[in-house]
Each structure stands twice: as structure tokens, then as C-alpha cells.
């Protein structure tokens, strides 16, 4: 006899970076019949929602109108089915952006380089921060952390086209809060003509979330699809 | 901007009853959910009921049976009615608002507040 249902999914919308202030959705999705779901935050019960009706809805949505620095961190959801509850969710990370600063970013020798040169990111934050993190932008979105007193360094190794592309860095103050993003930088790489194809796109993400990002710093604009899968969060961990 | 103020706070004895308000300005009240905290002296805030847009609510344990949350969207007010009040129960009682929000919402987690009101004082006593 099943002792638990399955877990249910859980993802931000439209990002889980979100800027201090603006808003964002956590939605969590499990099984028609739910009913009742519950979000919990960093081990505890954060909110509750009962769908209405059960039987027509699988999915519910939690929504955060103000971001802070207090609400940045793990959640994961459950689903009741009668007196049955479900596995726990998947941990979404989700991270507050736009605190404090604003770091610099640098690229060596420059962000025009041939296919094969070493290439080698410098992210710089001068406020208390140990963290730095360097984001590509685009489909794929990878993290990649570093660690340095006021400055890191992220090598590249010999680059390829696929690393051509916008960069952008953040300091991190802890896992869940991150400065504003720096400026971009553009790294052009020329190679010869049959390493220039299309750099493969991670299927896992099915949008440009930089872009989404972009739109939830600039306007605050809410989307009623999901842009990112609960797997974008293992970019975290 | 969202402001709350409580009222309805007092000495009672313990098994006796109060009944808090909680008045809210402006016109998104609607679209607010509704939480009552409360905080001892000496002692960290804590949830006690919560009700969504749409009237469902949420209990402490230590409250499910005694205490009942509910609102009237014409006079943009919450209550929090408590009998079979104890010793334990004293402390300052908060107000919350979570402003806007979707329909079933109910937030019982006080990080989830973006408004808050300034208190009102219940003191169970022999």
C-alpha cells in the first residue's frame, strides 16, 4: 500500500533571482484531488493554500509581492490527497539580487580572442564578500562560483565558440543574496570555419531566463508560464 | 501604502474571552491576506492564525479550538476572536498584511508580511 504520494514540482516565475522589492511567484504542482498544499521555507511551514476545485486543479501558486533578504533561501512543497501526503519537492533556491553593490567585470587578454587562447574572467566587488559568481547569459545560464577576498578569478581555459557570448557577475554575501548584477561583458571568439557552428543549448531550460531576469529588474513584469524547471536550481548546489 | 492599527487588547481572566480588530486603510484590503502574531515578553514572534482573500484559514496548534480568524471586506477590518484564554496566551498581538496576493493564499510564515500593525496588549490573569 503507497504510504506517500508523488512529489510534487516546484519553480519561480518568472525567475529565481529576484531583485529587492519586486515580486515573484512560486508555484507548485502535483496531482488533480489536491487538497491542500503547503510551501515551506528553510525547514518551516511558510504558506498554505487550498485549491478550489480540487478536482479541476493540479497546480497552485504562491505569491511573494515584495522580495527581501528574509525571504531568500530553500523551499520545497508538499500536497495532501484525503489524509495522504506527498513526498517533499525538489529545493528551490531562490535568491534575493541588488543588494549593496555593484561588482566590476573584467576579462584577460581582452573579449576579442582566438579560438584556443586561455581566457580568464575577473569579477571585483570591493564591499565585505567572499563569494563572486559568473553567470553566461542565455538558454543555458551557468553558474559558475568563485572565491576571493575583494576579487575572483574564473578561468576559462582554452575557449572555444561555445563560450562566445554576454557575462555578467555578481558578489554573493551569502548563498541566497547577491549584489546587483555588474555590467555586461561581451566575449567574441574567432575560430576557423568548422568550429563556428551553434554552441549546443542546454535542454533543461526552455527560455532566455537572463532576458526574464532583465524584464524582473526592469519592470517587475510577472509571467503566467514556467521559465525555469525545478533542475535549474542543482546550478546552485 | 497599507496601514493597520489593533485594538481590542486588555487584562482578562483566564477561560475568558477578548476579541481583537484590526483595522486596515486603503483600498487593497480585498486583495490582502490577513495574519494575527504574537509575541511574548522575552520571547520570539509567533504565527497564530491566518486567513486568505477567500475566508480559508490556518491555526497555531496551540490556538485550533479557542482562537477564530475572520474579516469583513466592507469595513476593511480582521478579527481575531480568543476564549478559554490562559496564562500562556499573554503577550502583544500583531496584525499582518501580505499585500497583494492570489486568492487561496494563507501565509504563516511572518517573513511572507509586508505590513504590520503596531500591537495590542492581552494579559490573561487570575
Known amino acids: 500500500q503507497q504510504q506517500t504520494l508523488p512529489k510534487p514540482f516546484i519553480w519561480a516565475e518568472p525567475h529565481f533571482m529576484v531583485p529587492k522589492e519586486k515580486q515573484v511567484t512560486i508555484c507548485c504542482q502535483g496531482n488533480y484531488g489536491a487538497v491542500e498544499y503547503q510551501l515551506h521555507f528553510e525547514g518551516s511551514l511558510f504558506a498554505v493554500d487550498r485549491p478550489k476545485p480540487p478536482e479541476r486543479i493540479n497546480k497552485v501558486k504562491f505569491y511573494i509581492p515584495d522580495m527581501n533578504s528574509r525571504m531568500a533561501g530553500q523551499y520545497s512543497c508538499i500536497y495532501r490527497v484525503g489524509e495522504l501526503w506527498s513526498e517533499p519537492s525538489n529545493l528551490l533556491d531562490l535568491v534575493v539580487t541588488e543588494m549593496y553593490d555593484t561588482p566590476t567585470l573584467s576579462v584577460h587578454p581582452g573579449p576579442e580572442v582566438i579560438s584556443g587562447e586561455k581566457v580568464t574572467f575577473y569579477c571585483r566587488l570591493d564591499t565585505a564578500t567572499s563569494m563572486f559568481l559568473l553567470l553566461k547569459e542565455g538558454r543555458s545560464s551557468h553558474v559558475q562560483r568563485g572565491y576571493g577576498k575583494v576579487q575572483a578569478e574564473f578561468p576559462l581555459g582554452p575557449v572555444t565558440t561555445a563560450h562566445r557570448g554576454t557575462y555578467r557577475c555578481f558578489g554573493s554575501y551569502n548563498n541566497h543574496a547577491w549584489s546587483f548584477p555588474s555590467e555586461p561583458v561581451k566575449l567574441l571568439v574567432t575560430g576557423d570555419i568548422e568550429n563556428t557552428s551553434l554552441a549546443p543549448e542546454d535542454p533543461t531550460f526552455p527560455a532566455d531566463t537572463w532576458g526574464t531576469y532583465l524584464l524582473t529588474t526592469e519592470t517587475g513584469l510577472q509571467k503566467d508560464h514556467a521559465l525555469w524547471d525545478h533542475t535549474a536550481q542543482n546550478l546552485l548546489r | 501604502e497599507v496601514q493597520l492599527v489593533e485594538s481590542g487588547g486588555g487584562e482578562v481572566q483566564p477561560g475568558g474571552s477578548l476579541r481583537l480588530s484590526c483595522a486596515a486603510s486603503?483600498?487593497?484590503?480585498?486583495?490582502?491576506?490577513m495574519g494575527w502574531f504574537r509575541q511574548a515578553p522575552g520571547k520570539e514572534r509567533e504565527f497564530v492564525a491566518a486567513i486568505s482573500r477567500s475566508d480559508d484559514t490556518y491555526y497555531a496548534e496551540s490556538v485550533k479550538g479557542r482562537f477564530t480568524i475572520s474579516r469583513d471586506n466592507a469595513k476593511n477590518t480582521v478579527y481575531l476572536q480568543m476564549s478559554s484564554l490562559r496564562a500562556e496566551d499573554t503577550a502583544v498581538y500583531y496584525c499582518?498584511?501580505?499585500?497583494?496576493?492570489?486568492?487561496?493564499?494563507?501565509?504563516?510564515?511572518?517573513?511572507?508580511?509586508?505590513?504590520w500593525g503596531q500591537g495590542t496588549l492581552v494579559t490573561v490573569k487570575p
Open positions: 486603503g483600498r487593497t484590503f480585498a486583495s490582502a491576506a
Open positions: 499582518a498584511a501580505v499585500v497583494p496576493t492570489y486568492g487561496n493564499n494563507i501565509y504563516v510564515h511572518s517573513a511572507a508580511y509586508n505590513y
